[in-house]
């Protein structure tokens, strides 16, 4: 027989409801009544002295008919105990001397053999008729994961004998499967919190706590939903789960009231060009509501009048925006504001930023091209374009000259300094057409090219006068 014990009872004979079995009658499986410990339960078939059927070992020897059937003695069927308690239970079997081969008893839980980390002891009690074997199993400080169906296995004459199961049901303090979660809510707007805890043992009752004070006087059965009609300031909520074993308290969760965001900070200029400024910022506190978009406000700093503010909207992320369509070489004041579902933040502190000088907006004028055949050069002249302040300081010109003749095409360019308004370039090909275009250059870049001017380059030494340039078709500039 066998039963389960509290841990403190360590003597072997205390594992049984009666004295240790010496030689039990063959095929008799006594039921041992459980001890009075409240953490033990009897088998499902209370009062049964032996099963209707037992699995008798198969023996292949000629004496098999003489071998009585062997089975594990009936043991306790169900143990209910509290988490962190200690438990012992056992299997026992009587093997008559007629059985020659027996292997050790192994313990199994939910179909898997228990190896290593578990504490089991097997004791043998021989007498003149055979041997009684008792396998003791103990678990120190049981956890919920120790829940399960335990049974013993043993090989006798190469036949596997399996005990009836011992169901171990671990009860403990309530265990949360759903705890309240932090939420951010609109001021004075109702919201729900959910708390669910389970045993065993059931039932589990829930009390809600707000800022250390109980919300509900009467407990609610788990799961519980708390409807809060609305808050005006941040609060901390938790739930208490109670069962017969005691109390478990959930984590405390902050319920925050959504407000407008704080203004962005650290507005920086990452890059400037003549017509754009790349600005970055660090978002302010989001006011417990995700930032939806941001607004970049731009005004000209130089204007005496309260110049109109340009507003550029962008997504809240990334915290970066390229302001475009600005004037070159101009000063701007820039600030950023962001919004969440509640509203717009105040604007960040204003910062100053400048665009760089631009490229010229007009091409050089009055371009003329003369062929100096004796020196085999082109003489090119132009007048300086009217460059605005924001176009920057003139640093030079780029002259593009393209040479075309039958089967030959050559595209070249020269850069000349701003001193003077003329240049000379060597003739590249005779019996060809040369097309010349000129653009002004400032630190802000290269401006537009002039309309093309064409000049025909005759064959070498066939002409005794110096031809002048002819405007390209559609060009009305004088030669």
């Amino acid at each position: 027989g066998g039963t389960a014990e509290k841990w403190e009872e360590t003597e072997l004979d205390q594992l049984f409801s009666g004295p240790l079995p010496g030689r039990l009658p063959v095929n008799h499986r006594p039921f041992s009544a459980p001890h009075s410990s409240r953490d033990q339960l009897p088998p499902p078939q209370t009062g049964r002295s032996h099963p209707a059927h037992t699995a008798a070992p198969q023996v292949t020897s000629t004496a098999s008919k003489l071998l009585p059937p062997v089975a594990f003695n009936h043991t306790i069927g169900h143990i209910v105990l509290s988490e962190h308690k200690n438990v012992k239970f056992n299997c026992s079997i009587n093997i008559p001397n007629t059985y020659q081969e027996t292997a050790g008893i192994s313990w199994w839980k939910d179909g898997k053999e228990l190896l290593g980390a578990h504490h089991s002891i097997t004791q043998f009690y021989p007498d003149e008729e055979g041997v009684s074997i008792i396998a003791l199993f103990s678990i120190a400080s049981v956890q919920r994961s120790d829940n399960g169906s335990y049974f013993c296995k043993m090989k006798v004459n190469n036949r596997e004998i399996v005990s009836d199961p011992i169901y171990v049901e671990v009860q403990g303090l309530p265990y949360f499967i759903k705890q309240p979660e932090s939420v951010n809510v609109t001021r004075n707007t109702a919201f729900n919190l959910t708390c669910q805890a389970v045993g065993p043992p059931e039932p589990v009752n829930i009390f809600w706590v707000q800022n250390s004070s109980r919300v509900n006087e009467k407990p609610e059965r788990s799961p519980s939903v708390l409807t809060v009609p609305g808050l005006t300031e941040t609060a901390v909520f938790s739930c208490e789960a109670h069962n017969d074993k005691g109390l478990t308290v959930s984590k405390g969760v902050h319920i925050n009231i959504k407000v407008i965001p704080s203004p962005p900070t650290e507005v920086h200029i990452l890059n400037s060009t003549a017509h754009s400024i790349l600005v970055s910022w660090v978002p302010g506190f989001d006011g417990y509501s995700p930032l939806q978009n941001c607004s970049i406000q731009v005004k000209e700093a130089d204007r005496l009048s309260n110049g109109s503010v340009m507003v550029f909207n962008t997504s809240a992320s990334p915290h970066l925006y390229e302001i475009q369509q600005l004037q070159a070489l101009a000063n701007y004041s820039i600030a950023v504001s962001c919004r969440n579902e509640i509203g717009w933040s105040a604007v960040s502190p204003w910062i100053l930023a400048s665009t760089t000088e631009g490229a010229p907006s007009v091409a050089p004028l009055n371009i003329t091209v003369f062929l100096n055949e004796s020196n085999n050069i082109l003489d090119i002249r132009w007048t300086k374009p009217p460059i605005k302040r924001q176009d920057g300081e003139l640093v030079g010109y780029r002259i593009s000259h393209v040479w075309e003749s039958a089967g030959t095409y050559k595209e070249l360019s020269e850069e000349v300094s701003q001193n003077g308004s003329w240049a000379q370039i060597p003739v590249q090909i005779h019996n060809a057409t040369c097309t010349v275009r000129i653009a002004a250059i400032t630190k802000g870049g290269i401006g537009p090219f002039s309309e093309p001017v064409n000049i025909i380059i005759p064959e070498h030494s066939k002409v005794d006068y110096a031809p002048s340039s002819t405007p390209a078709p559609g060009n009305t500039d004088s030669m």
């Epitope: 009544a33 409240r38 339960l41 089975a71 004998i161 399996v162 199961p165 065993p200």
Partner: antibody, heavy 118, light 112 residues
Framework: QVQLQQSGPELVKPGTSVKISCKAS????????IHWVKQRPGQGLDWIGW????????QYNEKFKGKATLTADTSSSTAYMQLSSLTSEDSAVYYC???????????WGQGTSVTVSS | DAVMTQTPLSLPVSLGDQASISCRSS???????????LHWYLQKPGQSPQLLIY???NRFSGVQDRFSGSGSGTDFTLKISRVEAEDLGVYFC?????????FGSGTKLEIK
């Protein structure tokens, strides 16, 4: 998840036998008792008995000894109940159910209808 | 055998009402260790029985908190605090303290 899938309805003649099955899944079949329950049309429930598949031990309600035979095939995780010498009194829906750790019949099969008619 | 007497046989209720079902055993269902193996089941039309309450007062997983069980020894009660349409069916008690296990005769919960 734990499931018990029973075989389909049976129409059998008086005096014959029928064997109905209950295939378990979602848990260790050899570790938990399987119980069988009878329900006659419009009537209550009658407990037939149990089998522990791990060792094939059985326990019967005296009322059903000689009528029902419980077996189990661990290789297919299937429990069987054979009903013999059938009469119209045996016409019923038969359920298999698992005895869970909480020592209650926690999961049930969908039932097998047996009709005994000549 | 432990005879389980269940009352009433039929229980007409209005939705939202409380319902109470009694189950009485011919012998005590309390074990020597203090546990009592009395369980409650609901069988909806055309379905298998489903476990509601185990060992007198423990709600099985997934069972609504409208269901509660109480009692000891030989007298047990199942209460449904606010009956909903999905609660309709036949309620059984089952004892597994003594062999053979025995069921109550059933209580049919129906709409008035």
């Amino acid at each position: 998840q734990v499931q018990l899938q029973q075989s389909g309805p049976e129409l059998v003649k008086p005096g014959t036998s029928v064997k109905i099955s209950c295939k378990a899944s979602g848990y260790s079949f050899t570790s938990y008792y399987i119980h069988w329950v009878k329900q006659r049309p419009g009537q209550g429930l009658d407990w037939i008995g149990w089998i522990f598949p791990g060792n094939r031990n059985t326990q019967y309600n005296e009322k059903f000894k000689g009528k029902a035979t419980l077996t189990a095939d661990t290789s297919s995780s299937t429990a069987y109940m054979q009903l013999s010498s059938l009469t119209s009194e045996d016409s019923a829906v038969y359920y298999c159910a698992r005895l869970g750790l909480i020592y209650a019949l926690d999961y049930w099969g969908q039932g097998t209808s047996v009709t005994v008619s000549s | 055998d432990a005879v389980m007497t269940q009352t009433p046989l039929s229980l007409p209720v209005s939705l939202g009402d409380q319902a109470s079902i009694s189950c009485r055993s011919s012998q005590s269902l309390e074990n020597s260790n203090g546990h009592t193996y009395l369980h409650w089941y609901l069988q909806k039309p055309g379905q298998s029985p489903q476990l509601l309450i185990y060992r007198v007062s423990n709600r099985f997983s997934g069972v609504q908190d409208r269901f509660s069980g109480s009692g000891s020894g030989t007298d047990f009660t199942l209460k449904i605090s606010r009956v909903e349409a999905e609660d309709l069916g036949v309620y059984f008690c089952l004892q597994v303290t003594h062999v053979p296990f025995t069921f109550g005769s059933g209580t049919k919960l129906e709409i008035k």
